[in-house]
Structure formats: structure tokens, C-alpha cells
């Protein structure tokens, strides 16, 4: 290690951040590049092919210049130096500009969401106070699974207006607890749309829909596909009658046969009278035999 070589050799003092610096040894970079110069010319760093370890030197210089965290003017131009930052570094930042966020997400494009990116997004969203539409647009463009990575508590800060930015694929990995939070927001966001347009928009969120909303949809000839039906909450599907399910699914009702062993279809069949199931003509088995009395125990509990 050449730690003792701290003085900058004659004629090597950097006047600007340029390509000549790629030929400097690490100790020469340390000795010959002024941190303030680096900070003011950060936009040049990304265009210069510094090595992995040369970047460590540049980062160290910035860390010494800004021990409390980098200003946004520097952060915006970090480029691939961002890949050298730790979550601890990023927690010191105050990122308020969407352009800065985009610039840093671009650096990580095509890779999994790293701990650094997750921390950056967390800092940005917390700074804004809510997940607004422009931010959500940006984040889901880079990470389609972003929304489903948030906890139900974090999702509660999403304003209904932001829901317009959500695409069906953004919800692919969401679990029922997340959809429980998102569905009411979507219902509010799309409330002024007409029947068929409303259904197209709300369909991806229906995993959070209560029974009464499913009953209402069944009256609107929506022809829900089986994939959507299979994602509905079991507790929301169970109270639906055979007639309601038939109306809800329309021509897709035939798909119930293939799914009769899977939730929520299996549990729903167990709650229906076999007579009623037979009216579908699909050969669904497992309903309540004719002549049996059905006791609604949930109602009994509510009365006691």
C-alpha cells in the first residue's frame, strides 16, 4: 500500500475532472483531486471510465467534504458512483426532486431492486409525505413489483388519485392484505366511470373487494374471467349465490369445473345447495345435499 505518498507529484494537480485522471494511481487521485472541484464537476464523472477502486477514492473525497450527507446538486449527478453508496450513506440524503430519483434509478436499471435503491425510494417517499401519481408512475416504470413490496401501512399513504398510474402487472405479486388497502382507493378513483370501463380499471384490484361490491358487479354483465375470480377473497365469495356467480362470470362460468378443487371455488361449492349447483350443468359436486337444513352460524354468533 502506498499510503505514505500523500503529496501530489509536481504537475499532476487536477485543474478539472477529465479523462486524464483515469491514468492516476489511487493515491495520486487522493492527493491531486480537490474535493470541492469534484463536487462542482460531478456531472463529468459519469462520462469518464474510472475504475471500481478509483471510484472508492472519489467517494471518500465526497464523504469527507459532506460528512452530514451529500447535497442534492451532487446526488443528481452521481451516476454510476451511486452503485458505490451504502444504505447508511443514502439515509443521510434529502432527495426531493423526481429528476434526481429518475437519474439514480436509471443507473440501476435492469437489475433487481438493491438495498441502496430501496433506501433511496424510502427516503424520497417519506420526504414527500405520500406516494403521489408522478412518483408512482416513475417507480412502477422501473420496478413493476414496487407497489406490492410496500406494507399495508405504507400503502395507506397512496392517495386515490395515484391509482390511475397503476397497471395490472404492478399488482401481480400483491397479497390480499395489500389489495384490501388498495381496492377502496381504486373504487374511489374510478367511481365516475361507466360500467364496462369501470370494470376494466377495477378488475386488477378486485382481490380486495367485499361481497356487496361483487354482488353489485354481478348485476352489470361484466363477464369476469376465471383468473380474476380465483384471486377474489374467499370470505367475499362464500356468500354469493349460484345465480350471482353465474351472472358475474357470464360465459366464463364453465371454467368453474376446472377449478372446483381450488380456493375459493372449492369453499364456495361447499356452501351451495347441490340443487342450485346442478342448474349450472357443469357437474360440480360437493354442495349441500337436498333436504339438509343450512344454519348460518355467523348470524347466530352475531345475535348472542
Amino acid at each position: 500500500r502506498e499510503v505514505e505518498k500523500t503529496a501530489c507529484p509536481s504537475g499532476k494537480k487536477a485543474r478539472e475532472i477529465d479523462e486524464s485522471l483515469i491514468f492516476y494511481k489511487k493515491w495520486e487521485l487522493e492527493a491531486c483531486v480537490d474535493a470541492a472541484l469534484l463536487a462542482t464537476q460531478m456531472d463529468r464523472v459519469n462520462a469518464i471510465p474510472f475504475t471500481y477502486e478509483q471510484l472508492d477514492v472519489l467517494k471518500h473525497k465526497l464523504d469527507e467534504l459532506y460528512p452530514q450527507g451529500y447535497p442534492e446538486s451532487v446526488i443528481q449527478h452521481l451516476g454510476y458512483l451511486f452503485l458505490k453508496m451504502s444504505p447508511e450513506d443514502i439515509r443521510k440524503w434529502n432527495v426531493t426532486s423526481l429528476e434526481t430519483l429518475k437519474a439514480l434509478l436509471e443507473v440501476n436499471k435492469g437489475h433487481e431492486m438493491s438495498p441502496q435503491v430501496a433506501t433511496l425510494i424510502d427516503r424520497f417517499v417519506k420526504g414527500r409525505g405520500q406516494l403521489d401519481k408522478d412518483t408512482l408512475d416513475t417507480l412502477t416504470a422501473f420496478y413493476p413489483g414496487y407497489l406490492c413490496s410496500l406494507s399495508p401501512e405504507e400503502l395507506s399513504s397512496v392517495p386515490p388519485s395515484s391509482i390511475w398510474a397503476v397497471r395490472p402487472q404492478d399488482l401481480d405479486t400483491c397479497d390480499p392484505r395489500q389489495l384490501d388497502v388498495l381496492y377502496p382507493k381504486a373504487r374511489l378513483a374510478f367511481q365516475n366511470m361507466n360500467g364496462s370501463e369501470y370494470f376494466v380499471k377495477i378488475q386488477s384490484f378486485l382481490g380486495g373487494a367485499p361481497t356487496e361490491d361483487l354482488k353489485a358487479l354481478s348485476q352489470q354483465n361484466v363477464s369476469m374471467d376465471l383468473a380474476t375470480f380465483m384471486k377474489l377473497r374467499t370470505d367475499a365469495v362464500l356468500p354469493l349465490t349460484v345465480a350471482e356467480v353465474q351472472k358475474l362470470l357470464g360465459p366464463h362460468v364453465e371454467g368453474l369445473k376446472a377449478e372446483e378443487r381450488h380456493r375459493p371455488v372449492r369453499d364456495w361449492i361447499l356452501r351451495q345447495r347441490q340443487d342450485d349447483l346442478d342448474t349450472l350443468g357443469l357437474g360440480l359436486q360437493g354442495g349441500i345435499p337436498n333436504g339438509y337444513l343450512v344454519l348460518d352460524l355467523s348470524m347466530q354468533e352475531a345475535l348472542s
Epitope: F23, K25, P49, F50, T51, Y52, Y80, L83, V107
Partner: nanobody, 119 residues
Framework: QVQLVESGGGLVQAGGSLRLSCAAS????????MAWFRQAPGKEREIVAV????????YYAESVKGRFTISRDNPKNTVYLQMNSLKPEDTAVYYC????????????WGQGTQVTVSS
């Protein structure tokens, strides 16, 4: 250790093109900067082109700017040099090099591939 093997050199007429390849083995070079150097008979070895570890930025010697293009394929551990509009003065042995530190220290080198441009 990183082993570098160059290929693609040969004899070409002035104005022609060649594409050099450099395959790295021994360890992944995804965090290494890669470069092409060249050495003409009786001259010092000089840098031709550099590409950084992300593939996002490059450097070219003035003499090859606009004619040569360096690129890399990290999953394949390979770096390329596309050489167009070749001139007799491009005749040299071309070496592939890799470093995580700087080009003046801790640099791995290939054996070289001969490029000859006839007029």
C-alpha cells in the same frame, strides 16, 4: 487471477474493418475496467480505448476517435473492439487489459493479437 485471451486480429487492407474479441476467465470481470492497448514495432505501448465496469462510459485515444468502438458483454466476460476505416498506422500488436485499480498498477494483460493494415 484473471486470464485474458485476444482473438480477431489479422491482415486487412486500408479502409477495411476488423473486430477484436477478448475473453476473460479465472474470475468474473464485471467490476473490472477493460481496455485495449497497442504496441507498434519500435514504439511504446499506448492505450487505445477503455470501457468502465458498468459499460456506461468509455475513453478513446485521439487517433482512433470516431473509427474504433469498445463494448463489453458482462455475462459473457468478453470485451470487443470494432475497428473501422483502418489505416496503415494502426498496424500493431493489440493487447487486452483489465484492472479494478488503475492502468498504472495491478493490471492483467493478454498475450496480444497482431493487426496488420496494408496500403
Amino acid at each position: 487471477q484473471v486470464q485474458l485471451v485476444e482473438s480477431g486480429g489479422g491482415l486487412v487492407q486500408a479502409g477495411g474493418s476488423l473486430r477484436l474479441s477478448c475473453a476473460a476467465s479465472g474470475r468474473t470481470v464485471s467490476t473490472y475496467n477493460m481496455a485495449w492497448f497497442r504496441q507498434a514495432p519500435g514504439k511504446e505501448r499506448e492505450i487505445v480505448a477503455v470501457i468502465n465496469w458498468t459499460g456506461g462510459s468509455t475513453y478513446y485515444a485521439e487517433s482512433v476517435k470516431g473509427r474504433f468502438t469498445i463494448s463489453r458483454d458482462n455475462p459473457k466476460n468478453t470485451v470487443y473492439l470494432q475497428m473501422n476505416s483502418l489505416k496503415p498506422e494502426d498496424t500493431a500488436v493489440y493487447y487486452c487489459a483489465a484492472t479494478r485499480t488503475s492502468w498504472t498498477e495491478n493490471t492483467y494483460w493478454g498475450q496480444g493479437t497482431q493487426v496488420t493494415v496494408s496500403s
